[in-house]
Interface confidence: medium
């Protein structure tokens, strides 16, 4: 009799789609790295399913993920960061599906923060600045940022600007006068590391002055 009988019908389980995706975050907590995986099908019954990573690890051959509701998560210093790791979905000792992944190619940076916009009356422009924790990191230092802004009334008309620095100048004449704007920023690795866009920073809202109206710092 199958050793997995108490875990439900394994034959039925093998018919399910166990496709999953993962992202890594390097030095997300001091020198600790994290790896987060989740099933692509939100309806997968995750009872008794475990994730395991093997290979390209320091001091150990394999590590098991912790389960946090519907995501699976590891926080560790033990990622070698060279070579591919084998990430498997398991029931007991049986692997249902595996992927070979280089953790340096699935990096998701932390979201930028401290986004602000200052209006310079004399220059007739807006200086956008933000911060990123990656400036202090050893590994994922070089990022491409995506600044997106829109007039608040234009639901889906976002204008995007890509930049590698954390400062951007928007010309007043390119914006509508006396309008409320929403702006936000996200980041993606842009050098040795590859991966995904970070979450968006919290939005910042600012109002453009009316024409010929002198104004200082934006709200």
């Amino acid at each position: 009799e199958s050793g997995y009988a108490q875990n439900g019908d394994l034959e039925d389980a093998e018919l399910d789609d166990y496709s999953f995706s993962c992202y890594s975050q390097l030095e997300v907590n001091g020198s600790q790295h994290s790896l987060t995986c989740a099933f692509e099908d939100p309806d997968v019954n995750t009872t008794n399913l475990e994730f395991e990573i093997c290979g390209a690890l320091v001091e150990v051959k394999c590590l098991n993920f912790r389960k946090l509701q519907e995501i699976y998560f590891i926080e560790t210093k033990k990622f070698l960061l060279i070579g591919k790791s084998n990430i498997c979905v398991k029931v007991g000792e049986k692997s249902l599906t595996c992927k070979k992944i280089d953790l340096t190619t699935i990096v998701k940076p932390e979201a930028p923060f401290d986004l602000s916009v200052i209006y310079r009356e004399g220059a007739n422009d807006f200086v956008v600045t933000f911060n990123t924790s990656h400036l202090q990191k050893k590994y994922v230092k070089v990022l491409m940022h995506d600044v997106a802004y829109r007039q608040e009334k234009d639901e889906n008309k976002w204008t995007h600007v890509n930049l590698s620095s954390t400062k951007l100048t928007l010309l007043q004449r390119k914006l509508q006068p006396a309008a409320m704007y929403e702006i936000k920023v996200r980041s993606i690795p842009d050098h040795y590391f590859k991966g995904f866009w970070s979450e968006w920073s919290p939005s910042y809202y600012f109002r453009t002055p009316e024409i010929n109206n002198s104004s200082g710092e934006m709200d």
Epitope: C54, G55, A56, L57, V58, E59, V60, K61, L80, L81, I82, G83, K84, N86, K100, D102, T104, T105, K138, Y139, Y192, K194
Partner: antibody, heavy 121, light 109 residues
Framework: EVQLVESGGGLVQPGRSLRLSCAAS????????MHWVRQAPGKGLEWVSG????????GYADSVKGRFTIFRDNAKNSLYLQMNSLRAEDTALYYC??????????????WGQGTTVTVSS | AIQLTQSPSSLSASVGDRVTITCRAS??????LAWYQQKPGKAPKLLIY???SLESGVPSRFSGSGSGTDFTLTISSLQPEDFATYYC???????????FGQGTRLEIK
């Protein structure tokens, strides 16, 4: 059978160039980082250069930096070392080696038999 | 870069002897160390990885120990085929970098 076969060595004058090749077989080449290690006559092992599976991670020993270039062609299961501005001190037996990071640490578990480079006028 | 210093540089021993070779790192490397054996005219052969894990097919008379900066390779009972040169090796993953010790030549007394 896992195998690495180096070629391209020979006698070359100082300042000239040479390209070494390493043909890999018996394993999934594009899953593994690869290295060049050399050994001068009667001397110890010296790591020369390494390249990650996808060519994005590359390293060189200080003694060859700026003169040697490592590259790979995963479609051809081949590793290369382009050696420019050769010096007498580059004379050595050059080994191609495969990493096996699944061991937990970065170790070289398969080595070729080497190809000899002699730099002399 | 981290330096690895092996000692002794050479030693003479007899069949059946217990032999210890040490490798000292210039800074702590956890257990990121491997040992290789090289016989004249041959390519190096992996013996030990993770400081103490025995490579498949390597006789159990070989063992490794240590962590941090001090590591040892021990051959519990020397066999005639063990006379060779032994190297320790360390790696750094970012940037990619490998360092070898200068080698220890083990000769028949």
């Amino acid at each position: 059978e896992v195998q690495l076969v180096e070629s391209g060595g020979g006698l070359v004058q100082p300042g000239r160039s040479l390209r070494l090749s390493c043909a890999a077989s018996g394993f999934t080449f594009d899953d593994h980082a690869m290295h060049w290690v050399r050994q001068a006559p009667g001397k110890g092992l010296e790591w020369v250069s390494g390249i990650s599976w996808n060519s994005r991670g590359i390293g060189y020993a200080d003694s060859v930096k700026g003169r040697f270039t490592i590259f790979r062609d995963n479609a051809k299961n081949s590793l290369y070392l382009q050696m420019n501005s050769l010096r007498a001190e580059d004379t050595a037996l050059y080994y191609c080696a495969k990493d096996e990071y699944s061991r937990g640490y970065y170790v070289l578990d398969v080595w070729g038999q080497g190809t000899t480079v002699t730099v002399s006028s | 870069a981290i330096q690895l210093t092996q000692s002794p540089s050479s030693l003479s021993a007899s069949v059946g002897d217990r032999v210890t070779i040490t490798c000292r790192a210039s800074q702590a490397i956890s257990s990121a160390l491997a040992w290789y054996q090289q016989k004249p005219g041959k390519a190096p052969k992996l013996l030990i990885y993770d400081a103490s894990s025995l490579e498949s097919g390597v006789p159990s008379r070989f063992s490794g120990s240590g962590s941090g900066t001090d590591f040892t390779l021990t051959i519990s009972s020397l066999q005639p085929e063990d006379f060779a040169t032994y190297y320790c090796q360390q790696f750094n993953s970012y940037p990619l970098w490998i360092t070898f010790g200068q080698g220890t030549r083990l000769e028949i007394k």
